[in-house]
Structure formats: C-alpha cells, structure tokens
C-alpha cells in the first residue's frame, strides 16, 4: 500500500515538545489483551524521515541479516529486498540463510505508481527491539522493482500489518503478525506511537531522530495522555473504521456521512497524508481555506504540491483551524472524537529553503479509494490495534507537536444515530481485492 | 485594463528610508485573486523579489531583506506601498511592482520600474 | 534553497532561426516554473507559467517543455522583436522568489 502520495512518511522527537503534557486521566476502559504498563525493551524502536517512512529493526535468516523494515498498516505482505538496488545499502541473502525455505512461487504487486515482484519463502524472523522471540514467518523476497524503494529512506523492505485478507497473492499467505501470535504466547494487539517532527529537519537531525515506538503484544501507558477510546475494526481486511462526522474549528461538514467512508476507511501507518474521498476533500479544503482567510495560498499548496514557507518560528499555526473526525464507538449511538492541529497535516519539508525558513505541503490530499489516516493523523495520537477484540484505540500521544494554546485531543463520548449506515458497502467482484495501488 | 504605476523619489541618501508608492488602475486591489509584490533589479543585474502583500494585509518578506522592508497597502487610494531603511548603495535598483496572478503564483503584470539611486 | 541556473549566458542567433534555452533548478520544482522576457528599459514580462502554459497575449512561437529539474524554453522562429533577456523563476517553494541568473539572446 506504498506509493503515490501513500510515500512512507517522516521521522521525529521522542519527548512533548515545549515540556507540554496532558494531565493523566483515569482509564475507563475496560481491560485490554496483553501486557499492560512497561513495555521499555519496545520504548523508541522506530526510526524515520520526513515523508520517508517508519522503520523497526528486524532480523532475518540464519545467521541473522539486520534490515530496516517500513511499518505498514495498509497492507499484509512481509516483503524485503533480496537483490542489489541502487537505493539499497544491505538486502536478504537468501543463499547465506541455512533456514531459509523456498515456496517456489511467485508474488506480484502492481501500485497506482510502480511495483515489487519477488519470490515467497519462508525464514526465521526476530525484532531486536521487540518481543524476545523467533518466529518462522512467510518473506516476499523482492527480486525486481519500480519505484517502490525511496532513496535515502534508509529501509530496505516492508512489514505489512494489516490481515489476510489482503494478502498476495492471495489469503493463503498468513502475514507475520499472525505467525506471531500463532507461534508465541504474545498478545494479538500492537500499537503504534509515530512521532512528527512538526519542523523541518537537516539530514543530521534526521538520521539521529527518533521516529517513535512500536509496542508488541499490548499498550504502554507511558506513550499517551488521558484516556484510550476505542472504534471497532468494521471488517477485517486494511484496518477499516467508521468516520460518522467530520468538522473544521468545530464547523460541521454537514455530508452524508457515508461519504466519509466512500469507499472505505483505513488506519494506514504507511501512507504520509490524511486523505479524503473528492467531495469531502473538496468540501474540507473549502472551510480550511475560509478559515484561515486572513492569509491566501497559492492553489498548489492545497494540492499538496507547493511548499509554503516562513521566517524560521513565525509559521502562524493560529490561522489555521482544527480538523475533527468522529469515529463510531464501541457503545450503540455512541462515537468520539480526535482533534489534529495544523502541526499535524502542515508536514515540514526539508532542504528546500534557506535555514532562515520554515517551509511546510499541506498533508492533506484527495483519494479515489476511500479515507486513509495516515501519518498525518496518527502522528498526533498513540494508535492502539487491538486485532483480538476487532477495535483499534486512540489517545492523545505524549510525543505529538502542538503550541501553548492548542493541543491535539481525544474526546468523548457523542450521542451519534445510526452510525451503521454511515459505512459503504462495497460490490463484491472477483477484482474488489485489487486495490492495491492508492494514488 | 489593469495598470500599475510606481511612483516616489529617485535619489536616496545612505541610511535613511526609501519609499515608493504602486498605484492600481483599471481594477481593484482588493481582489480576492491576487497578491501585490515588489521586486528590484540592480542595474544590469538579475530580479530580486521583495515581498508581496495582499489586500487583507497579510506579507510575505524576502527572507534577506526582512529586517528593513515594509510592505503595506491602503485599498481606499488603490495602492500599495513599500519601505525599505538603512539604505546602502546596493539597494540601488530599479523597482518593480507587480501583481500576483494565476492562483497567487505568478507575476501577470508588472509596473514599468522607477529607478531608485542611493547616494549621498 | 533551491537555485536555479540558466544556460547559455548569452545566445547568439539569427532571425528566424530557432532559439532553444534551459534553466535547471538544483532540486525538483515540479511544473512550477514560470518563463519572463524583457527587453532594454522595460518590465519583464509573463511569457510562460506552469513550465509549459503561454500567458495571455504571448504568440505560439514561444514554448515551454519540462518538469522536475529540467526546463526548456523554446522560441520557434526568432522575430526581431524576440532579441531580450529571457529569465525563468520557480514559484514551487512559495513565496515566489528565486529567478535564474538570465540568458540573453542577440542578434549574430
């Protein structure tokens, strides 16, 4: 589910900028699956740069190969490069590896822009910085490729989080999440902190950044603020949820909530932008825009193409309004929200200006293929995937870029009628799994 | 049709303020489709952008003039106007105002220049 | 920052002949380029934006082709009136201030 504006995303700061932290709130929720409280082994595993994707570490093989692994919600494939590439620096060597096994067969997968085709195994698979276990889990081992590396990302392969469903080349290729679970005692929940960086950064700062956390098996309390709200997973395919209401400073979109959701949405740690189908991007960007009237941008800012710039620390983060999204609840009529700020969806763009500027793309951008909470979103909260009890959390993330006078929020709970109607119902044809591509 | 006419002294002493005035013709400037910019060239040199203003009031500085530039405007005389202090003989230069056309992007229409020489 | 430099500095034609000039920014600006004339004691004027749109008014002698880090700008046919300094500018960073150094093209 890489490519096209779904370009792996940006790295970031561990700590909450200008030492602000919500005050804790009691967690009302109900117990979750796994380990609870101190995942520290797990604490800051994430590397990135800006729009370039987040990485773990992983071990592949036997001996162990270290690669750096792009951390992909949108998609359920473990892939990792397993040829030269001039972007690579390392790749699997499948040949040094004395528990490698060849499935002798082929994998194939075509984006909107570019794509990968490899060869299906199956090895032995560890993440230093994750759960002490080795798992003996399915690897495409990429062979040739179009556009899908990014030179410089400092990744040489992807893990695809998402479910079987999604699979290539079909539902048949268990993803490594769920040989994780199938072949450990480890809970089947993970949870993502991504951490923006919120200014731009030079190539020092960001290869030295860090980009976040990815917690194994359960929630560590010391990554978010108040309280976790959860939204059931719809189906399990992408992780696909329900948006029912959508505001811009507190404006309501005023749509059929079904738009929102036209044709899904998905929680996709792989693609950089907040994206909205085209009436709702149209009809968002339309009240951004009045919103912060007082300033005027050039018509390819709004299409994510134009940089704007600023003298360094006088971006005016004020004129630009909140952007709300409502999310079904786990209760009936019930739903809550999740606030980002400007700092969330203007990305920072590196080495385009003098160090005396500030240069920033608007991060949000049109979709044909539904909603995608991508970096834009999840940068500002610590992101829960509770696969065992088909729901994904939301809070507040500690590490999230914010000001004195706004902060990125959690919130709940609404009163919201027939929510179910709000998701789309999408024909089933044999093609209805080929989406893979989202440009 | 749309006009701009640049207009203030030619001969600047060193450290003092030199000013000019872009008066609009023939449309509005407070148009919602433009920005107003001011832009130099030192004689047989390359174009320097300056700043830009729209007609709320919202500037945008060259980075490396920022310290001494003002740009403002005044929609009930049609203009717009701008300051630059602490003048030096590299600020002479032949001044441009212009408008900001094509989705705020581009410079559509230029005034003719007024040469501005600073010197004591 | 993104710097942009035009070749050759000085082109020297016949009329009629066709003149072919380049401006290349040091990192990619995408399509958003614009092409300016200007002649001796006049204001530069809109020819080309976009990398590739002729402005109001500009005759289809004048073209403009790339994208990314290359563009070319194009006069098919060199009238008399066409003998100027020919500079591009990038409005991909925004506010639009980086022009190119200038190419000037004379009469041979």
């Known amino acids: 589910t890489h490519l096209g504006i779904r370009l792996p995303l940006r790295s970031g700061l561990a700590g909450p900028p200008l030492g602000l932290r919500l005050p804790r709130e009691t967690d009302e929720e109900s117990e979750e699956p796994g380990r609870r409280g101190s995942f520290v082994e797990m604490v800051d595993n994430l590397r990135g740069k800006s729009g370039q994707g987040y990485y773990v570490e992983m071990t592949v093989g036997s001996p162990p190969q270290t690669l750096n692994i792009l951390v992909d919600t949108g998609s359920s494939n473990f892939a990792v490069g397993a040829a030269p590439h001039p972007f690579l620096h390392r790749y699997y060597q499948r040949q040094l590896s004395s528990t490698y096994r060849d499935l002798r067969k082929g994998v194939y997968v075509p984006y909107t822009q570019g794509k990968w085709e490899g060869e299906l195994g199956t090895d032995l698979v560890s993440i230093p910085h994750g759960p002490n276990v080795t798992v003996r889990a399915n690897i495409a081992a990429i062979t040739e490729s179009d556009k899908f590396f990014i030179n410089g990302s400092n990744w040489e392969g992807i893990l695809g989080l998402a479910y079987a469903e999604i699979a290539r080349p079909d539902d048949s290729l268990e993803p490594f999440f769920d040989s994780l679970v199938k072949q450990t005692h480890i809970p089947n929940i993970f949870s993502l902190q991504l951490c923006g960086a919120g200014f731009p950064l030079n190539q020092t700062e960001a290869l030295a950044s860090v980009g976040g956390s990815m917690i194994i098996g359960g929630i560590d309390h010391s990554l978010y603020t108040g309280r976790l709200w959860y939204t059931p997973i719809r189906r399990e395919w992408y992780y696909e949820v329900i948006i029912v209401r959508v505001e811009i400073n507190g404006q309501d979109l005023k749509m059929d909530c079904k738009e929102y959701n036209y044709d899904k949405s998905i929680v996709d740690s792989g693609t950089t932008n907040l994206r909205l189908p085209k009436k709702v991007f149209e009809a968002a960007v339309k009240s951004i825009k009045a919103a912060s009237s007082t300033e005027k941008f050039p018509d390819g800012f709004w299409l994510g193409e134009q940089l704007v710039c600023w003298q360094a620390g006088t971006t005016p983060w004020n004129i630009f309004p909140v952007i709300s999204l409502y999310l079904m609840g786990e209760v009936t009529n019930q739903s809550f929200r999740i606030t980002i700020l400007p700092q969330q969806y203007l990305r920072p763009v590196e080495d385009v200006a003098t160090s005396q500027d500030d240069c920033y793309k608007f991060a949000v951008s049109q979709s044909s293929t539904g909603t995608v909470m991508g970096a834009v979103i999840m940068e500002g909260f610590y992101v829960v995937f509770d696969r065992a009890r088909k729901r994904i959390g939301f809070a507040v993330s500690a590490c999230h870029v914010h000001d004195e006078f706004r902060t990125a929020a959690v919130e709940g709970p609404f009163v919201t009628a027939d929510m179910e109607d709000c998701g789309y119902n999408i024909p089933q044809t044999d093609e209805s799994t080929l989406m893979t591509g989202r440009a | 049709q749309l006009q701009l006419q640049e207009s203030g002294p030619g001969l600047v002493k060193p450290s003092e303020t030199l000013s000019l005035t872009c008066t609009v013709s023939?449309?509005?400037?407070?148009?919602?489709?433009?920005?107003w910019g001011w832009i130099r060239q030192p004689p047989g040199k390359g174009l320097e952008w300056i700043g830009q203003?729209?007609?709320?009031?919202?500037?945008f500085y060259n980075p490396s003039l920022k310290s001494r530039v003002t740009i403002s405007v005044d929609t009930s005389k049609n203009q717009f106007s701008l300051k630059l202090s602490s003048v030096t003989a590299a600020d002479t230069a032949v001044y441009y105002c212009?408008?900001?056309?094509?989705?705020?992007?581009?410079?559509?229409?230029w005034g003719r220049g007024t040469l501005v020489t600073v010197s004591s | 920052e993104i710097v942009l430099t035009q070749s050759p500095a000085t082109l020297s034609l016949s009329p009629g002949e066709r003149a072919t000039l380049s401006c290349r920014a040091s990192?990619?600006?995408?399509?958003?380029l614009a092409w300016f004339q200007q002649k001796p004691g006049q204001a530069p004027r809109l020819l080309i934006y976009?990398?590739?749109n002729r402005a109001t008014g500009i005759p289809a002698r004048f073209s403009g082709s790339g994208s990314g880090t290359d563009f070319t700008l194009t006069i098919s046919s060199l009238e008399p009136e066409d003998f100027a300094v020919y500079y591009c500018?990038?409005?991909?960073?925004?506010?639009?201030?980086?022009f190119g150094g200038g190419t000037k093209v004379e009469i041979k």
């Open positions: 500018q990038q409005v991909y960073v925004w506010p639009p201030r980086t």
């Open positions: 212009a408008r900001l056309g094509h989705g705020y992007s581009y410079f559509d229409l």
């Open positions: 990192q990619s600006v995408s399509s958003y």
């Open positions: 976009d990398a590739s």
């Open positions: 203003i729209y007609y709320s009031g919202s500037t």
């Open positions: 023939g449309g509005s400037i407070s148009s919602s489709s433009y920005y």
